[in-house]
């Protein structure tokens, strides 16, 4: 059987939702010593990066300028060490936003509810679209989808303090082309006192998995690795 290297990790830097005409940055994290990284879009080669020097960095960044609907879709990456290629990374969905119009978002019964009540978000957009998306800030991977001619419902609950936070909705013209975001609606959930201290407040920074963690190998890292190996042997 043909030998392959472990698959790399593909990520979007800061966010996978990129406003039109802005630059998207995708990171492909492979391994030290990789001489070439390829970015594939919808199954076809899109870009190539060669790290310099290859043995000192474990990945590359691909910059995609002037984001538009033709560049929105599914990306993956692979890398090569010598003649040996890696498996393909998981697919990353890159979305272009700020297309066409801005939807409006409302929540029933209101933005201030008590723990245990059920809430429904309503997203409305008058221009032709049939799919709507609801996202919670700080949890942008957890996209809820709903369908409707000009508006859609997102039932939720019974709510707990974990549902607290800001929500936005988008209209979607296809899976990868979204409208401008709605104004945020902040959901405040009171009650549920025993769980309040455990409920995380939503981060205002981008989602933690939407950051590129490419590292340069330094002499110190090699020393630490050697020290760790020696310590393990001593423990044995």
């Amino acid at each position: 059987p043909k030998q392959t290297l472990p698959k790399p990790i593909i990520r979007a830097e800061s966010t996978y939702m990129v406003p039109k005409e802005k630059q998207a940055t995708l990171c492909c994290q492979g391994s030290y010593g990789a001489v070439e990284y390829q970015l594939h879009f919808e199954g076809s080669l899109f870009a190539v990066e060669r790290p310099k020097p290859p043995e000192r960095i474990n990945g590359v960044k691909f910059h995609i300028p002037d984001m538009n609907s033709r560049k929105a879709g599914r990306y993956s990456c692979i890398y090569r060490v010598g003649e040996l290629w890696s498996e393909r990374s998981d697919l990353l969905d890159l979305v272009v936003t700020e297309m066409y119009d801005t939807p409006t978002l409302s929540v029933h019964p209101g933005p201030e509810v008590t723990s245990g009540e059920k809430v429904t978000f309503y997203c409305r957009l008058d221009t032709a679209t049939s799919m709507f998306l609801l996202l919670k800030e700080g949890r942008s991977r957890d996209v809820q989808r709903s369908y409707g001619k000009v508006q859609a419902e997102f039932p939720m609950g019974p709510v707990t303090t974990a549902h607290r936070g800001s929500y936005r909705c988008f209209g979607s013209y296809n899976n990868y082309a979204w409208s401008f975001p709605s104004e945020p609606v902040k959901l405040l959930v009171t009650g549920d006192i025993e769980n309040t201290s455990l409920a995380p407040t939503d981060p205002t920074f981008p989602d933690s998995w939407d950051t590129c963690l490419l590292t340069r190998e330094t002499g110190l890292q090699k020393d630490l690795a050697l020290w760790d190996h020696t310590a393990q042997n001593l423990l044995r």
């Epitope: 409302s106 209101g110 509810v113 008590t114 245990g116 009540e117 309503y122 609950g157 019974p158």
Partner: antibody, heavy 115, light 107 residues
Framework: QVQLQQPGSELVRPGASVKLSCKAS????????MHWVKQRPGQGLEWIGT????????NYDEKFKNKATLTVDTSSSTAYMQLSSLTSEDSAVYYC????????WGQGTLVTVSA | EIQMTQSPSSLSASLGERVSLTCRAS??????LNWLQQEPDGTIKRLIY???SLDSGVPKRFSGSRSGSDYSLTISSLESEDFVDYYC?????????FGGGTKLEIK
């Protein structure tokens, strides 16, 4: 304090339409849902639909979708419900009620459909 | 559509008596339930929201509670002005639905 003012009564002919009003005061009109509820004489309460004045989002009970149309005029803080193709079945008291939790209620408008 | 089954449909009781009205929800509504009071002239007032929260200005003799899918309104000691109609209302899921009502009559 919150007030919802509705006309006391409306007399309309069968087949005609009527536009009921609900003038709101004492709160920010665009920040709260406005529901409409029907009560036939001697009967219980029935939800018709709701509108969010801040965004014109509407939601109707399926059985009233071709009967009622909800609108608002934010400049006068007034909610409206138009009832079309009226029959004797539409003779009832119609209430507007503010807030997703139906917190405040108007006095109701008695609609009588009669030739 | 969520059905709200309210019982009893009518109830005769005496002044000072403790009474309970019940609504059973056909589906999960969480705590999204109101109790409303309707006077003979048609005036409607909300007494309880979110199952057990008392509206401001409502006497403390009114209370709301829940046991599974059964929701109760209890009046601890009936006063003369309490002999009117009562409705439960679920606002968990549209179409929002009312119980059939309870007519509370003086014995």
């Amino acid at each position: 304090q919150v007030q919802l003012q509705q006309p006391g009564s409306e007399l309309v002919r069968p087949g005609a339409s009527v536009k009921l009003s609900c003038k709101a005061s004492g709160y920010t009109f665009t920040s709260y849902w406005m529901h409409w509820v029907k009560q036939r004489p001697g009967q219980g309460l029935e939800w018709i639909g709701t509108i969010y004045p801040g965004s014109d989002i509407t939601n109707y009970d399926e059985k009233f979708k071709n009967k009622a149309t909800l609108t608002v005029d934010t400049s006068s803080s007034t909610a409206y419900m138009q009832l079309s193709s009226l029959t004797s079945e539409d003779s009832a008291v119609y209430y507007c009620t503010r807030d997703g939790r139906f917190a405040n209620w108007g006095q109701g408008t008695l609609v009588t459909v009669s030739a | 559509e969520i059905q709200m089954t309210q019982s009893p449909s009518s109830l005769s009781a005496s002044l000072g008596e403790r009474v309970s009205l019940t609504c059973r929800a056909s589906q999960d509504i969480g705590s999204s339930l109101n109790w409303l009071q309707q006077e003979p002239d048609g005036t409607i007032k909300r007494l309880i929201y979110a199952t057990s929260s008392l509206d401001s200005g409502v006497p403390k003799r009114f209370s709301g509670s829940r046991s599974g899918s059964d929701y109760s309104l209890t009046i601890s000691s009936l006063e003369s002005e309490d002999f009117v109609d009562y409705y439960c209302l679920q606002y968990a899921s549209s179409p929002y639905t009312f119980g059939g009502g309870t007519k509370l009559e003086i014995k």
